[in-house]
């Protein structure tokens, strides 16, 4: 780790469209990138009538939106497809939705994904 920062070397991998994209369906993905740039993990999912459907999980390239985030949390209010990113090995294993609202407190619970 650099100055206490957790370097990301591998992430949980999942692809719901694995057949179409000709990839594995699930596993662990080693993260590659330019040696001086930061690497992250990401997760994307949909909420279909209260049921969580993972779209993809994997490695994500240097992105200031993800810096120093140990947890994978989507903060955007009601996106069509939820996306979060984080730093640290396998940090995308769990992901959450906590929309940033003016006054109200977040009401959502962390999601522990179970790929279908």
């Amino acid at each position: 780790a650099i100055l206490g920062r957790s370097e990301t070397q591998e992430c949980i991998f999942y692809n719901a469209n694995w057949e179409r994209d000709r990839t594995n369906r699930t596993g662990v993905e080693p993260c590659y990138g330019d040696k001086d740039k930061r690497r992250h993990c990401f997760a994307t999912w949909k909420n279909i009538s209260g049921s969580i459907e993972i779209v993809k999980q994997g490695c994500w390239l240097d992105d200031i939106n993800c810096y120093d985030r140990t947890d994978c949390i989507e903060k955007k209010d009601s996106p069509e497809v939820y996306f979060c990113c984080c730093e640290g090995n396998m940090c995308n294993e769990r992901f959450s939705y906590f929309p940033e609202m003016e006054v109200t407190q977040p009401t959502s619970n962390p999601v522990t994904p179970k790929p279908p």
């Epitope: 993809k56 994500w60 240097d62 200031i64 069509e80 497809v81």
Partner: antibody, heavy 115, light 111 residues
Framework: QVQLVQSGAEVRKPGSSVKVSCKAS????????INWVRQAPGQGLEWMGT????????SYAQKFQGRVTITADTSTSTAYMELSSLRSEDTAVYYC????????WGQGTLVTVSS | QSALTQPRSVSGSPGQSVTISCTGT?????????VNWYQQHPGKAPKLMIY???KRESGVPDRFSGSKSGNTASLTISGLQAEDEADYYC???????????FGGGTKLTVL
């Protein structure tokens, strides 16, 4: 090695639309943003918008809002930029670039708008 | 989303140093370490030189350096060489909750 290969030059009439493609290779397409930038002849760079290919989420510069649509096809690792209601001032070279830092660029696509 | 402000041109002799400034606001240049610098030779695509204010892109000579003070970022090129003659643009990280914006560009002439 990372490569972004764009579609060829286009000539369009005012009022029509153009769709430029950007095929990525040498890295995982769903691991970073694709940005679109244009440069009119003799002018500077102008940011048009960005897409997160994995979620499909887009952001557009205010100037192009309502006229530009950026999409991505993860099965072919290709991003697209469509600009509608073309006018002569849209004559420019259009570039795609990888990631939030724009660390790799396509070769550019010249779009000429002329009656 | 107003364009960042750069000088239209700068010049220097081989071996000298030049500095190009890029002035914005607290929401772009002054916000976090979002500023990048690009070099563009005529008829070519831009090339990333400096990202995150001061980090040199892989393969870029250490003659190129970046810094920031308040809402103004600077690119310094020391030991000027003929091949450094090009247009230089500052710009900001774009993606997620961040919108992109570029400076108007600075033409560097090596005398």
């Amino acid at each position: 090695q990372v490569q972004l290969v764009q579609s060829g030059a286009e000539v369009r009439k005012p009022g029509s639309s153009v769709k430029v493609s950007c095929k990525a290779s040498g890295y995982t397409f769903t691991s970073s943003y694709i940005n679109w930038v244009r440069q009119a002849p003799g002018q500077g760079l102008e940011w048009m918008g960005t897409i997160n290919p994995v979620s499909g989420s887009t952001s557009y510069a205010q100037k192009f809002q309502g006229r530009v649509t950026i999409t991505a096809d993860t099965s072919t690792s290709t991003a697209y930029m469509e600009l509608s209601s073309l006018r002569s001032e849209d004559t420019a070279v259009y570039y795609c670039a990888r990631g939030g830092w724009f660390d790799y660029w396509g070769q550019g696509t010249l779009v000429t708008v002329s009656s | 989303q107003s364009a960042l402000t750069q000088p239209r041109s700068v010049s220097g002799s081989p071996g000298q140093s030049v500095t190009i400034s890029c002035t914005g606001t607290s929401s772009d240049v002054g916000s976090y370490n979002r500023v990048n610098w690009y070099q563009q030779h005529p008829g070519k695509a831009p090339k990333l030189m400096i990202y995150g204010v001061s980090k040199r892109e892989s393969g870029v000579p250490d003659r190129f350096s970046g810094s920031k003070s308040g809402n103004t970022a600077s690119l310094t090129i020391s030991g000027l060489q003929a091949e450094d003659e090009a247009d230089y643009y500052c710009g900001t990280f774009a993606g997620g909750r961040y919108y992109g914006v570029f400076g108007g560009g600075t033409k560097l002439t090596v005398l």
